[in-house]
């Protein structure tokens, strides 16, 4: 029950996280105009991964896409790539985890297969979350660097007569959405990995010991010890007791009515 709950919760948390990563990637507010010195501005600038926007105080908003690929900073391209990889991995992870859910029965899928799929999706969620966190953090670092660079030469003038105020950008809402979403996806992935351990059938098959009583001589044949982790090739629930000392792995050559366990 706890395993199902952990798996289900991991799936839901990851689902929310990936939805957040998608939302953050699509959002226009990755960087917003710094309003520290001027809280009320007639023209407000903000930028996303795909386009930059200007909102005028009168209500008019205009967005323009980055219609160049080569002209964009390498860092921005890297952030785009990280976010897209995160989304793709997360989407595949979600697809895999749907089939892995314990509460959903698909044909005669065994628990070991579900455990494998749960682990796979968990790892995908972890990598997806890390990609998102990395992407957002790279962008945030880029913003911090540019912020202090623009602060250093905040005012550039012609003979000190005319002031040109340089627009500074600070963290936008998308960064926080991305960090939280990445974190949730990561947590969801960890939960899936934990659930996977509980799903794996813990098989400790103690093979029978055979005693062959033939006159005075006692033949002692020890059975092998096998503990299945659930990831082996032979993951069927084994029939441990089969009348005598025989197992499905090992058939005795000379069965006898005097065989005991």
């Amino acid at each position: 029950m706890a395993v199902t709950a952990c798996q289900g919760l991991g799936f839901v948390v990851s689902l929310i996280g990936i939805a957040g990563i998608i939302a953050a990637t699509c959002m226009d507010q990755w960087s917003t105009q710094d309003l520290y010195n001027n809280p009320v501005t007639a023209v407000f600038n903000y930028q996303g991964l795909w386009r930059s926007c200007v909102r005028e105080s009168s209500g008019f908003t205009e967005c323009r896409g980055y219609f160049t690929l080569l002209g964009l900073p390498a860092m921005l391209q890297a952030v785009r790539a990280l976010m897209i990889v995160g989304i793709v991995l997360g989407a595949i992870g979600l697809l895999v985890s749907i089939f892995a859910l314990k509460c959903i029965r698909i044909g005669s899928m065994e628990d070991s297969a579900k455990a494998n799929m749960t682990l796979t999706s968990g790892i995908m969620f972890i990598v997806s979350g890390l990609c998102a966190i990395a992407g957002v953090s790279v962008f945030a670092n880029m913003l911090v660097t540019n912020f202090w660079m623009s602060t250093a030469n905040m005012y550039t003038g012609m003979g000190g007569m005319v002031q040109t105020v340089q627009t500074r950008y600070t963290f936008g809402a998308a960064l926080f959405v991305g960090w939280v979403a990445g974190g949730l996806t990561l947590i969801g992935g960890v939960m899936m990995c934990i659930a996977c351990r509980g799903l794996a059938p813990e098989e400790t098959n103690y093979k029978a010991v055979s005693y062959h009583a033939s006159g005075h001589s006692v033949a002692y044949k020890p059975g092998g010890f096998k503990a299945s982790t659930g990831f082996g090739s032979n993951t069927k629930n084994k029939k441990i007791y089969d009348g005598g000392a025989r197992t499905e792995d090992e058939v005795q050559s000379y069965p006898s009515k005097h065989d005991y366990v």
Partner: antibody, heavy 118, light 113 residues
């Protein structure tokens, strides 16, 4: 097309409060515009007083901020200007105007002359 | 506050001739976000409210004749009437639409010579 019409008393006594209303037709006051008040003293230039925008936020000219209040009544599709403690220097033609793209005033009312005199 | 200074204060031009009005702002009106200059031009005829001519320094408002054009960037702007018509006699104002408070130039009166 949006049409604006100012209304209010043409004569106000010094130290009293000037109250004007702008009635909007052909559009909603809740639509994505800013609704401004601008004045023009006789024979002089234009001065922006302030605005109330689509979300109800106001912004005033700092030179008049302590005396100005702009409000709106969405049910009547009107917005209003209140200017307290008026003096003869506040005598002007008062215009209401709509600003949108480029923060430019695209629609104007015909204006109403307000004289401050005892 | 951004101070807008227009020149000349008045201008007399013959019909069909070019009229040029200058406007200078004390701060740049160029927004780096969209590379647009937030300067607007208005025409005001006697007894009428101002009429929007040009916004974003060079974008003509719909319905405005193409003889009106705006140019300039940063702090220096120009309104040009390529061929003055009798109906163009008016006072022309430039406006800072970039920074609060929105401010107007003192106006330039255009007359026929």
């Amino acid at each position: 097309q949006v049409q604006l019409q100012e209304s209010g008393p043409g004569l106000v006594k010094p130290s009293e409060t000037l109250s004007l209303t702008c009635t909007v037709s052909g559009g909603s006051i809740s639509s994505n515009y800013a609704w401004n008040w601008i004045r023009q003293p006789p024979g002089k230039g234009l001065e922006w007083i302030g605005y109330i925008n689509y979300s109800g936020n106001t912004n005033y000219n700092p030179s008049l901020k302590s005396r100005v209040t702009i409000s709106r009544d969405t049910s009547k599709n009107q917005f209003s200007l209140k200017l307290s403690s008026v003096t003869a220097a506040d005598t002007a033609v008062y215009y209401c105007a709509t600003s949108y793209y480029g923060n430019s005033f695209i629609y104007w009312g015909q204006g109403t002359l307000v004289t401050v005199s005892s | 506050d951004i101070v807008m200074t227009q020149s000349p204060d008045s201008l007399a031009v013959s019909l069909g001739e070019r009229a040029t009005i200058n406007c200078k702002s004390s701060q740049s009106l160029l927004n780096s976000g969209n590379q647009k200059n937030y300067l607007t031009w208005y025409q005001q005829k006697p007894g009428q409210p101002p009429k929007l001519l040009i916004y974003w320094a060079s974008t003509r408002e719909s319905g405005v004749p193409d003889r009106f054009s705006g140019s300039g960037s940063g702090t220096d702007f120009t309104l040009t009437i390529s061929s003055l018509q009798a109906e163009d006699v008016a006072v022309y104002y430039c406006q800072n639409a970039y920074s609060f408070p929105w401010t107007f130039g003192q106006g330039t009166k255009v007359e026929i010579k």
